[in-house]
Amino acid sequence: HNTTVFQGVAGQSLQVSCPYDSMKHWGRRKAWCRQLGEKGPCQRVVSTHNLWLLSFLRRWNGSTAITDDTLGGTLTITLRNLQPHDAGLYQCQSLHGSEADTLRKVLVEVLADPLDHRDAGDLWFPGESESFEDAHVEHSISRSLLEGEIPFPPTS
């Protein structure tokens, strides 16, 4: 699995999407888990509704929400009020019995809030033609990791 990078701004919401084959994964609940270390387990953060037809109902665990479009084949995770400690490697999973298939590996990167004057530096500020409202849209910048890029710092 390639790793897809999703970048969000601290304090704002980040939406992560995980596409999948809706027929292949028919009837399966989904989950969002956080990878603990490069070879460690993936710790469940939140899973979709325990009744599969109701997977479209948003389920929350703390500031993380999950909802599943089982017809279109898109799992959506929302990280609300993104914080620096939310950065890291995650997985979207499809559950069957005690097994879990990885739908997508996701690296969440948290960018400093450009409106936070405490650490302004050379950060971007909205120009005259840009409203502050525009600065608070939900950010979901994503890219795939380039070959050779390592999502975790190498262990010594």
């Epitope: 809706s22 028919w26 009837g27 509704h49 325990n50 009744l51 599969w52 037809l53 109701l54 479209f56 109902l57 089982t70 017809l71």
Partner: antibody, heavy 121, light 110 residues
Framework: QVQLKESGPALVKPTQTLTLTCTFS??????????VSWIRQPPGKALEWLAL???????IYSTSLKTRLTISKDTSKNQVVLTMTNMDPVDTATYYC?????????????WGQGTLVTVSS | DIVLTQPPSVSGAPGQRVTISCSGS????????VSWYQQLPGTAPKLLIY???NRPSGVPDRFSGSKSGTSASLAITGLQAEDEADYYC???????????FGGGTKLTVL
Amino acid sequence: QVQLKESGPALVKPTQTLTLTCTFSGFSLSTSGVGVSWIRQPPGKALEWLALIFSDHDKIYSTSLKTRLTISKDTSKNQVVLTMTNMDPVDTATYYCARTLIDRSVYFDYWGQGTLVTVSS
Amino acid sequence: DIVLTQPPSVSGAPGQRVTISCSGSSSNIGHHYVSWYQQLPGTAPKLLIYDNTNRPSGVPDRFSGSKSGTSASLAITGLQAEDEADYYCATWDGLMNSIVFGGGTKLTVL
């Protein structure tokens, strides 16, 4: 054995709010995958699903009537209540409650006898 | 709005076999299980078939269900006078995220 019975007014005036109660026995709404739906049928017409409530206070509504419907439950009394606002003569129908089994599929395995509600001034 | 399409009426002589069709789309029948209900005159509907083909206990094996693509069918063999009723199909619709019924089919036993 599983039983459901609807109760409520036989006649409501236009613009009024309808409140219907479904009293059930023989099953628990605390059981995962078990819920209660409301379904209606205007005279001589087809069945129409309205709303469903189940464990964990989860509920879903018909998209076309969502703004007018509220479904709630009292687990201790084994009752499910449906309220429908701004009633109109076209809402005249027999209203049924039915036990609903839902997970990867959904169906109604036990039905109440139904209660006829007429909307007229 | 009626999402699933059924013929308004079908008929057959006693002992014959009749089928009632239920046509939908990929967002409902194409993706989900179908159930069937029988409504005798003046009574509440009764579950006949669930999960496309399964019969609840007490339903005679003269009633059978099937599904292919975006359509489902209810077949009744050895037609009897007491089968005269309205029949409804139902399923989940993944676009509307709700339960949908067919318009119903009136079965007349000649």
